[in-house]
């Protein structure tokens, strides 16, 4: 069934851990991302955000988990209102920065 | 365009060992994961394993111990190393590459047809 | 390693009927309410083609008469109307593990 909202965020809160944490080379090849807006429809900003990054195995699951999160389908080349389209940074730091914000949306209780 | 071309030595001796070549273009092979399929003559594809972008490497369980998969990014290559080889790895291969997620096999090589006889 | 068991083995349909090939996995493809199974069509003398991604989607320029289906451990390609260019063996496969799988193929003719 479904994954419950608050199993979810705990599960991708601990696999961003694991990025972070295991991180040795750059991630991603330092690739960019689009950083986004972390308010409402945030699995789905961050799907459309890391979905453009290929071939990076350290972050397959969380892609996994996004897309499984989302409600919609989401494709490379896919961009919503969501993304702050100016601003571009490496995939370590967009990890580090939706961890952050997970966290406290965690400690705060907000589930959805 | 993205293109990918195999090339292999064509007859190996049994108990020999098979170095195959992926030559890629139109795209990077640092953002870019490739796999290695082979089909022998007459029946279906198996996947022998694949290199990630950032270099992980993935193995079929049952091969493992006779395959190396290796690239040279900065020469756009993938290698497929395969040892002790005997007359049922005769076979078709193809190096594939993988899309965006879900990193399904969007485009193939050609292939490279590989004998291994004496 | 995930085992994948396609039938019939191989099957002829008619011009404009529909053709329906099955993939049965040995335990469940599916990760976060995703199904990890893909579809492949293999003309002879040709390296595989992709079709479908994610159980049931399209991929681009593949025409709609191709359609997926199904999750977990059960899953089919439905080929609607047939066309004579659809002559192929069609290969499922999936990558619901680091150690991927495919199927032992479907010849399809066309009667």
């Known amino acids: 069934g479904p994954v419950p909202p608050s199993t979810a965020l705990r599960e991708l809160i601990e696999e961003l851990v694991n990025i972070t944490q295991n991180q040795k080379a750059p991630l991603c090849n330092g690739s960019m991302v689009w950083s986004i807006n972390l308010t409402a429809g945030m699995y789905c900003a961050a799907l459309e955000s890391l979905i453009n990054v290929s071939g990076c195995s350290a972050i397959e699951k969380t892609q996994r988990m996004l897309s499984g999160f989302c409600p919609h389908k989401v494709s490379a080349g896919q961009f919503s209102s969501l993304h702050v389209r100016d601003t571009k940074i490496e995939v370590a730091q967009f990890v580090k920065d939706l961890l952050l914000h997970l966290k406290k949306l965690f400690r705060e209780g907000q589930f959805n | 365009e993205v293109q990918l071309k195999e090339s292999g030595p064509g007859l190996v001796a049994p108990g020999g060992s098979l170095s195959i070549t992926c030559t890629v273009s139109?795209?990077?092979?640092?953002?870019?994961?490739i796999n290695w399929v082979r089909q022998p003559p007459g029946k279906g594809l198996e996947w022998l394993g694949m290199i990630w972008g950032d270099g992980r490497i993935d193995y079929n369980d049952a091969l493992k111990s006779r395959l190396s998969i290796s690239k040279d990014n900065s020469k756009s290559q993938v290698f497929l190393e395969m040892n002790s080889l005997r007359t049922d790895d005769t076979a078709t291969y193809y190096c594939?590459?993988?899309?965006?997620?879900?990193?399904?096999?969007?485009?193939w090589g050609q292939g490279t047809s590989v004998t291994v006889s004496s | 390693d995930i085992v994948l068991t396609q039938s019939p083995a191989s099957l002829a349909v008619s011009l404009g009927q529909r053709a329906t090939i099955s993939c049965r996995a040995s335990e469940s493809v599916d990760s976060y309410g995703q199904s990890y199974m893909h579809w492949y069509q293999q003309k002879a003398g040709q390296p595989p083609k992709l079709l479908i991604y994610?159980?049931?989607n399209l991929e681009s320029g593949v025409p709609a008469r191709f359609s997926g289906s199904g999750s977990r451990t059960d899953f089919t390609l439905t080929i609607d109307p047939v066309q004579a260019e659809d002559a192929a063996t069609y290969y499922c496969?999936?990558?619901?593990?680091?150690?991927?799988?495919f199927g032992g193929g479907t010849k399809l003719e066309i009667k």
């Open positions: 594939a590459r993988d899309g965006y997620f879900p990193y399904a096999m969007d485009f």
């Open positions: 994610l159980a049931s």
């Open positions: 139109g795209f990077s092979l640092t953002d870019s994961s």
């Open positions: 496969q999936q990558n619901a593990e680091d150690s991927r799988t």
